[in-house]
């Protein structure tokens, strides 16, 4: 039952977080405008990663495409990268959870295959998550960069009597989406991670042990026995012996490691 | 289309608290700002303050102490209270609506408010 | 607060000819998001309320006659009137539209010569 509550949690956490993640690539707040200086102007400017946006008091709100490609900054670029492969990654390993997920019935899929899978799905969330969290953390340092020389730059040359206010950028309400979550992804695919380590049928070698059951008899086998943890749907190790009727989670609470064949 | 009316007394005494009303029509007050603007006679333009579609508002420095903007949107009328008057705030006062670039692309005709005993 | 000067205070111009108004801001109108200058004009005549000629320093207002032309950015504006009418006879004023308080120039008085 651990297992599968682990498993699931772990889908659910990581497609919040992925969702998280396209809607913060998507969002134009990744930088705003620092009103510190200037905190009575009648117009917004922010900007995103595709479009750069201004908001006039008035409630008006116009927004530019960025149609350069070879115009924009490395930097830019790099997260745009990294977001996306961070979605893409994540969209592959939701596919392949659902799959995995042990409550959802394919075919005779065997438990090591729903493991392996498992595994995968959450190595691409961890993955997708690092990607995500690296993306928005070169945005932010690009941002604290920027503002310190900006801020640098204000105070030089104002010796005229005109006054040129620098428009200063600050951290956009995107960036802390993405930082939560990209670590929602993250915990996602360590909680996938912790659950295939629970599916996955573990090889051991066990002597032979003589049971009886009265009433039945019982046919059993020396050598490999393959430990099950009670999850999944074992077909190789299924219920010859029933000793009365139990759900597959009533199976896993047993204390034995000994499966009957 | 759009239209703006202020209404309000035209004699006001010396201390006492200037109120008017700014009724409009042919647009949302939920969506777009409306500014004070006043001319004393003779004079040029002086902008008092505004009230945003959202309700928030912005006052002229040297007025801040003494005005206050509000609005009833189900009604479609915004309000100006400017308290402690002098004989300096006798002046046309007009209402007028915000547009693209903060402008106001539409006044109102404006209404002569006179301080005096 | 942003203080605009406008001269000449007045202006008399013969009819047909151009007539050209100065706007200068302390401070720069330039918004960098968009590269628009927040920089309005407009026209008031006799007995009637201020009426919007240009806003962005230099778009027009729907209606306005294309006579009327705004240009200049950051702090120095201009306001052409390439061929000057009798109705166009009135005060103009510039106003920052950048920064609160939304401050007016004095007025220019353009009178026919």
């Known amino acids: 039952m651990a297992v599968t509550a682990c498993q699931g949690l772990g889908f659910v956490v990581s497609l919040i977080g992925i969702a998280g993640i396209i809607a913060a690539t998507c969002m134009d707040q990744w930088s705003t405008q620092d009103l510190y200086n200037n905190p009575v102007t009648a117009v917004f400017n922010y900007q995103g990663l595709w479009r750069s946006c201004v908001r006039e008091s008035s409630g008006f709100t116009e927004c530019r495409g960025y149609f350069t490609l070879l115009g924009l900054p490395a930097m830019l670029q790099a997260v745009r990268a990294l977001m996306i492969v961070g979605i893409v990654l994540g969209a592959i390993g939701l596919l392949v959870s659902i799959f995995a997920l042990k409550c959802i019935r394919i075919g005779s899929m065997e438990d090591s295959a729903k493991a392996n899978m498992t595994l995968t799905s959450g190595i691409m969330f961890i993955v997708s998550g690092l990607c995500a969290i690296a993306g928005v953390s070169v945005f932010a340092n690009m941002l604290v960069t920027n503002f310190w020389m900006s801020t640098a730059n204000m105070y030089t040359g104002m010796g005229g009597m005109v006054q040129t206010v620098q428009t200063r950028y600050t951290f956009g309400a995107a960036l802390f989406v993405g930082w939560v979550a990209g670590g929602l992804t993250l915990i996602g695919g360590v909680m996938m991670c912790i659950a295939c380590r629970g599916l996955a049928p573990e090889e051991t070698n066990y002597k032979a042990v003589s049971y009886h059951a009265s009433g039945h008899s019982v046919a059993y086998k020396p050598g490999g026995f393959k430990a099950s943890t009670g999850f999944g749907s074992n077909t190789k190790n299924k219920k010859i012996y029933d000793g009365g009727a139990r759900t597959e989670d009533e199976v896993q609470s047993y204390p034995s490691k000994h499966d009957y064949v | 289309q759009v239209q703006l009316q202020e209404s309000g007394p035209g004699l006001v005494k010396p201390s006492e608290t200037l109120s008017l009303t700014c009724t409009v029509s042919?647009?949302?007050?939920?969506?777009?700002?409306v500014s004070w603007i006043r001319q004393p006679p003779g004079k040029g333009l002086e902008w008092i303050g505004v009230?945003?579609?959202?309700?928030?508002?912005n006052y002229h420095s040297t007025l801040i102490s003494r005005v206050t903007i509000s609005k009833d949107t189900s009604k479609n009328q915004v309000f100006l209270k400017l308290s402690s008057v002098t004989a300096a705030d006798t002046a046309v006062y007009y209402c007028a609506k915000a547009g693209r670039g903060n402008a106001l692309d539409y006044w109102g005709q404006g209404t002569l408010v006179t301080v005096s005993s | 607060d942003i203080v605009m000067t406008q001269s000449p205070d007045s202006l008399a111009v013969s009819l047909g000819e151009r007539a050209t108004i100065n706007c200068k801001s302390s401070q720069s109108l330039l918004n960098s998001g968009n590269q628009k200058n927040y920089l309005t004009w407009y026209q008031q005549k006799p007995g009637q309320p201020p009426k919007l000629l240009i806003y962005w320093a230099s778009t027009r207002e729907s209606g306005v006659p294309d006579r009327f032309s705004g240009s200049g950015s950051g702090t120095d504006f201009t306001l052409t009137i390439s061929s000057l009418q009798a109705e166009d006879v009135a005060v103009y004023y510039c106003q920052n539209d950048y920064s609160f308080p939304l401050t007016f120039g004095g007025g220019t008085k353009l009178e026919i010569k």
């Open positions: 009230i945003w579609g959202d309700g928030s508002t």
């Open positions: 042919g647009f949302s007050l939920t969506s777009y700002g």
